[in-house]
Interface confidence: low
Amino acid sequence: DGCNDIFMKNEMLSASQPFAFNCTFPPITSGEVSVTWYKNSSKIPVSKIIQSRIHQDETWILFLPMEWGDSGVYQCVIKGRDSCHRIHVNLTVFEKQWCDTSVKGLPNLSDEYKQILHLGKDDSLTCHLHFPKSCILGPIKWYKDCNEITGERFTVLETRLLVSNVSAEDRGNYACQVILTHSGKQYEVLNGITVSITERAGYGGSVPKIIYPKNNSIEVQLGTTLIVDCNITDTKDNTNLRCWRVNNTLVDDYYNESKRIREGVETHASFREYNLYTVNITFLEVKMEDYGLPFMCHAGVSAAYIMLQLPAPDFR
């Protein structure tokens, strides 16, 4: 069908509440493109009728609410004048009773649902709410172990819960709740967040910092060999994975057959109170398909990309 498959995105979702996913993939979606959503390789697009429980809203797919039978792979097709790209999104719906202590945690929680507070610091938790502008979100309520959070140490600021002077007792299971209004109907969004406490101090906390790349472009001639380092500072006791990905896939897996683009061996240097890691990506031969594609360096929750671009023509 002439469409390039970009990547597979996996999402774990809670049943019986709204969910939305935005089909955005810069730089592809930054130009004049049309976006169409499909389910499970169906030829029939997802409805654009706003009264439908599942419908497309501009570039978003919106579930009001998500139900058990909605699990599956959804495709978003991005068509430009001379291009076609397809993103696959694998949605898995699970039943989670946030206040049911017999349910032991969640499978493969994303980083949005696992957050860290720093002992003795003023810190915050974030309620991640990704919905199109047709969805109106009310004020957020916060709960810990199923009780609404009160007390002068806690302040709600937009989508954040500010926690002053974090103590060990602040670890546990939190939830943020918000009422979402869409076309006159109201739905409850309840996001559970597992909170752990770290004693790490210093400027970086426990979030790895990618020094390079900086979401920048690199001019490189077609056919040349290119090696790019990803430099990361992180705490000495970190357990973060560091890797290069393209289209949300490890480069070694994505280029498994040709081995044209490979991730290098990670090295690190130990400083006074942190480590500096270097992991490179090698392009044995830069091809046309590499241009304009974000090659992402990941370190724990941090990510940054390089994008290859052709050098400007020299008219001298």
Partner: antibody
């Protein structure tokens, strides 16, 4: 914006103790490294030592027997004391801290410096 | 102690020149830091972790090196670049600076 400001007497008599204060704003000294460096007139920079957020101190071995770095977290200040000074301790004294791009060793924020002259 | 030796100690150059300052360590260091200092002012972090430019540093500056030999290069000298440059290592305490390289207008 992190700002550091040194203060203390500009003239100290030989054999006395040099005492300087670094007042920090825009950051808490309960996080990161807080360093002292000096610049001898017409010469290069010399690293004196640091106090870490935990209270741990490190001193350059060449000065270790004479130097003390301390702090007062309630005032967000840290201090340098250098005992038994001689004319060789005449220098511009700087307080500085790192943390640029989360690299704590990169001394990004500096005070403007204070000239201390040792003379009778 | 790791001794840091910068060369040259002073350098006269003209606007537009390409300038290289070298810093040699008496034993291996992992990374080099460079600072720029102008008369009567505090040093400014210029290059960190060998090759990363600090905020506001023009792209005509670059840093490179490994082991015991590191360089700071200015591709096309500008009037505001005339200053003293110091290298520093944080690999092994005591954390030593080079003696400085004074860059002057020819």
């Amino acid at each position: 914006q992190v700002q550091l400001q040194e203060s203390g007497p500009g003239l100290v008599k030989p054999s006395q103790t040099l005492s300087l204060t670094c007042t920090v704003s825009g950051a808490s000294i309960t996080s990161g490294y807080w360093n002292w460096i000096r610049n001898h007139p017409g010469k290069g920079l010399e690293y004196i030592g640091y106090i870490y957020y935990s209270g741990y101190t490190y001193y350059n071995p060449s000065l270790k027997s004479r130097v003390t770095i301390s702090r007062d977290t309630s005032k967000n200040q840290y201090y340098l004391k250098l005992s038994s000074v001689t004319a060789a301790d005449t220098a511009v004294y700087y307080c500085a801290t790192g943390g640029y791009d989360y690299v704590e060793d990169a001394l990004y924020y500096w005070g403007q410096g204070t000239l201390v002259t040792v003379s009778s | 102690d790791i001794q840091m030796t910068q060369s040259p100690s002073s350098l006269s150059a003209s606007v537009g020149d390409r300038v290289t300052i070298t810093c040699r360590a008496s034993s291996n260091v992992r990374y080099m830091y460079w600072y720029q200092q102008k008369p009567g002012k505090a040093p400014k972090l210029w290059i960190y972790l060998t090759s990363n430019l600090a905020s506001g540093v023009p792209s005509r500056f670059s840093g490179s090196g490994s082991g015991t030999s590191y360089t700071l290069t200015i591709s096309s000298l500008q009037p505001e670049d005339f200053a003293t440059y110091y290298c520093q290592q944080f690999t092994t305490s005591p954390y030593t600076f080079g003696q400085g390289t004074k860059l002057e207008i020819k």
